[in-house]
Interface confidence: low
């Protein structure tokens, strides 16, 4: 090989050992019969050399550095050449370095021809092995702007006071052009400006200078995004850290087209803007850091550009100003991750602050819009607390558990609407009265409606799930001893059409000791299936529940249990069931941990079924399923 560097070219070539490998046989550069492991060639020198092995690319790397001095004379602007030409160089992993020094008042612009660049983070590598490492200078300090691969959106990087560009090419890569040019610009009065151009839909991940280390103190860095007017851009911060500021505040500023409040200033912890049409700028501003404990400022963010959806121009008003203790969350429904590019699905507050999920709280009116290709990718979950702290104020008061119409009008499916109903301990209890009688969901008779009410205890230490209930059954009311959560869960988009069937009223009533009482008024047409709370896990220890079952005068009720034995084994106490005729008060008592369950029995008058649990041994829980069927009386037994 022969390398000749012209005089005044300001080029230095360095061939040196690369990262050591476990190859047994060493390799040397052979020059004038000398064996060396490093060779430096300066401007004006001509050197002939060879290698002592057949695969020098496994041992050596070559660095070609060109110093460009714009301080003392005119700058060689324009397209940057690869000198010496790659065809004249040995086939080693090679790094071309251009080190441009300029006055602070001079702006330097690196322009990248297509394919543009894509920034990568620490630990990432480029698929083709071609990387661009770009750094700038603040006085004597080198600042890493970033490492970039091909096939991205970054088209230009502007800096001042100098720039160092390193192009790394693997030994096998055929590239023979630098792919960029240098131009001079007026002072940019900041560390750097990165221009990112989107031709169509796509995303770009970008990072602050020196990432993942700290952004230089009190510096300013700007990203300019060129976005076709028919597309929309959204910014989301993937990772950031704030330093300890002594003066000023770390922030990001946006220049957004059409905004009357430019620049729009955001804290890094704020939700960032979305649904922006056309070009915009984003700037990161550092602060004066505490000398003793500076901390670090760093930022990694993503810009997502996509087509606006029909919904993105619609504004929905969610009026929660008259609500309290309520939060509404719009979020992605769980899905399997797809590997291909999926357009973002965002919900936007005031059409500007967009994110993949959004929580609205009571006490205000909210204006929201959507930036999403498919709104079925989102759903809504709502929580509302109705609490009574003073039994004297709340006793006998009633509240309607209805999904507000503002929420039903949103174009996103409601998943859960949970009411947390809180009462003063041992002072008040609750009664739930449905607009339409409820059916308890069982394996034998599952609910097939578009929604159900899930009723569970809301006392943290108590694991008690009363069951899932849907309209169209025989349960007239449910009384519960203390705090519960009632969740309206939807199962089908048809809930919108069936919403009129929802309707549950809760009333605060005088305290009673039983965990739950179900009032059942069976219809003559169907069999009513009822089961104990906490099905599959067993009725909690020492818990008592009752069913008040009405039997019309002209009917007889058949009570049937679906097991021969309850299966419960008591560790302490007794588990028992009482079946009591309401008219005569006559009762039968069954020991559930000893006796067999009663055979089907016929009841001519309304009756109670009361089940009380012991403290069962683990694995031997109390689960009972029974049914009530009405048939016409053939003989009047009164």
């Amino acid at each position: 090989f022969e390398i000749a560097l012209p005089r005044e070219s300001n080029i230095t070539v360095l061939i040196k050992l690369g990262t050591p490998t476990l190859l047994a046989k060493p390799c040397y550069i052979v020059i004038s019969k000398r064996h060396i492991t490093m060779l430096s060639i300066k401007s004006g020198e001509r050197i002939v050399f060879t290698f002592s092995c057949q695969s020098p690319e496994n041992h050596f790397v070559i660095e070609i550095q060109k110093n460009i001095d714009c301080m003392s004379g005119p700058c060689p602007f324009g397209e940057v050449q690869l000198q010496p030409s790659t065809s004249l160089l040995p086939t080693l992993n090679r790094t071309f370095i251009w080190d441009v020094k300029a006055h602070k008042s001079i702006g330097l612009e690196l322009q990248f021809s297509i394919p543009r660049l894509r920034q990568i983070g620490p630990g990432e590598s480029c698929p083709d092995g071609v990387t661009h490492s770009i750094s700038g200078r603040i006085d004597a300090t080198v600042v890493r702007i970033g490492t970039f691969c091909s096939n991205g959106t970054v088209s230009r990087i502007k800096m001042q006071e100098g720039v160092k560009m390193a192009l790394h090419l693997p030994w096998f890569h055929p590239r023979n052009v630098s792919g960029f040019s240098i131009a001079n610009r007026s002072s940019i009065k900041r560390l750097c400006i990165i221009e990112s151009v989107f031709e169509g839909e796509g995303s770009a991940t970008l990072m602050s200078a020196n990432y993942p280390e700290g952004f230089p103190e009190d510096e300013l860095m700007t990203w300019q995004f060129v976005v076709p007017a028919h597309l929309r851009a959204s910014v989301s911060f993937l990772n950031f850290n704030l330093s300890n500021c002594e003066r000023k505040e770390e922030r990001v500023e946006y220049y957004i087209p059409g905004s009357t409040t430019n620049p729009e200033v955001f804290k890094l912890e704020d939700k960032q803007p979305g649904n922006m049409a056309g070009n915009f700028n984003l700037s990161l501003q550092g602060c004066d850091q505490d000398a003793q404990s500076p901390g670090i400022l760093r930022l990694q963010f993503q810009v997502l550009v996509q087509h606006p959806q029909n919904e993105s121009n619609k504004i929905y008003v969610v009026d929660l100003s008259n609500e309290r203790a309520m939060s509404l969350t719009i979020e992605p429904r769980p899905v399997k991750q797809s590997r291909k590019f999926v357009p973002g699905c965002f919900v936007c507050l005031e059409s500007r602050t967009c994110s993949s999920n959004l929580t609205l709280t009571s006490g205000s009116k909210h204006k929201i819009s959507f930036l999403c290709d498919d709104l079925t990718r989102l759903w809504m979950n709502v929580e509302k607390t109705i609490s009574c702290t003073d039994h004297r104020y709340c006793q006998r008061k009633s509240y309607s558990l209805q999904v507000p119409s503002d929420i039903l009008h949103l174009p996103v499916e409601l998943h859960d609407f949970s009411w947390k109903l809180l009462v003063p301990k041992d002072r008040l209890s609750l009664v739930l009265v449905p607009a339409q009688k409820l059916q308890q969901h069982t394996h034998e008779k599952p609910c097939n409606t578009s929604f159900s009410y899930l009723v569970a205890s809301a006392i943290p230490s108590q694991d008690l799930y009363f069951g899932s209930f849907c309209p169209g059954g025989s349960i007239k009311q449910i009384q519960v001893k203390q705090n519960i959560s009632v969740t309206l869960r939807t199962f089908a988009p048809s809930f919108q059409q069936e919403a009129s069937r929802q309707g549950l009223t809760v009333s605060f009533i005088p305290y009673f000791k039983e965990e739950g009482v179900f009032t059942v008024t069976p219809d003559t047409k169907s069999k009513v299936y009822l089961r104990t709370p906490n099905w599959d896990r067993g009725l909690p220890s020492l818990t008592s529940v009752s069913w008040n079952i009405s039997v019309p005068r002209d009917q007889v009720a058949c009570l049937t249990f679906f097991k021969e034995r309850s299966g419960v084994v008591c560790q302490t106490g007794r588990a028992f069931m009482i079946i009591q005729e309401q008219r005569t008060r006559a009762e039968e008592i069954f020991s559930l941990d000893e006796d067999v369950l009663p055979k089907p029995s016929f009841h001519h008058h309304s009756f109670w079924v009361n089940i009380s649990n012991c403290s069962p041994t683990s694995g031997k829980q109390l689960d009972l399923l029974f049914s009530v069927t009405l048939t016409p009386r053939t003989v009047d037994l009164t």
Epitope: A325, G363, C388, D390, C394, K397, Y399
Partner: antibody, heavy 119, light 107 residues
Amino acid sequence: QVQLQQSGSELKKPGESVKLSCKASGYTLTDFSMHWVRQAPGQGLKWMGWINTETGAPTYADDFKGRFVFSLDTSVSMAYLQISSLKSEDTAVYYCSRGRDYDPHFDYWGQGTLVTVSS
Amino acid sequence: EIVLTQSPATLSLSPGERATLSCRASQSISDFLHWYQQKPGQAPRLLIKYASQSISGIPARFSGSGPGSDFTLTISSVEPEDFAVYYCQSAHSFPYTFGQGTKLEIK
């Protein structure tokens, strides 16, 4: 719009009685509770109690049990506060206010009635 | 009963300054706390409900924080019409109580 219109100022002698009225308009009286608040001259606000406008059941704070009576006439959307055996320390502005929700905040107030008790 | 202690008793500020009014409850009352403004010769006016919820028609410069036992009413930039007495009120349990008030006066 919602309004609570209170009766005019009263000048009374110790030992006499007075009945203050509060007329609710712009909403249905029975949908919200009615509370009474007292403010002595140059002093802060003191909650006297409330009346359940659905049932007519009153609740009094401890300092206002005995001589103070809350009542209603729902047919004319009126709430009343009667104070008997007036004392000089009853001199104050009395406000009626509408209670919202199950843990009330007072979103609308009457303009207040000044009761002066002086011999 | 819940005792509410407001501080300072008097706050002297110039228009444009930020006002921070404190209300401390004798025990935790969650967010069952409301703020009222009262001008001389007028009835109180509800400013903030449930510690931090804004009220329709009340300027956005009024904000509140909570829950717990320490509550704050903040006026981001005091306007001339904001000089008045401010009361906090507990709605946690009977009897409902008011703080003794903070007078915001012109400096």
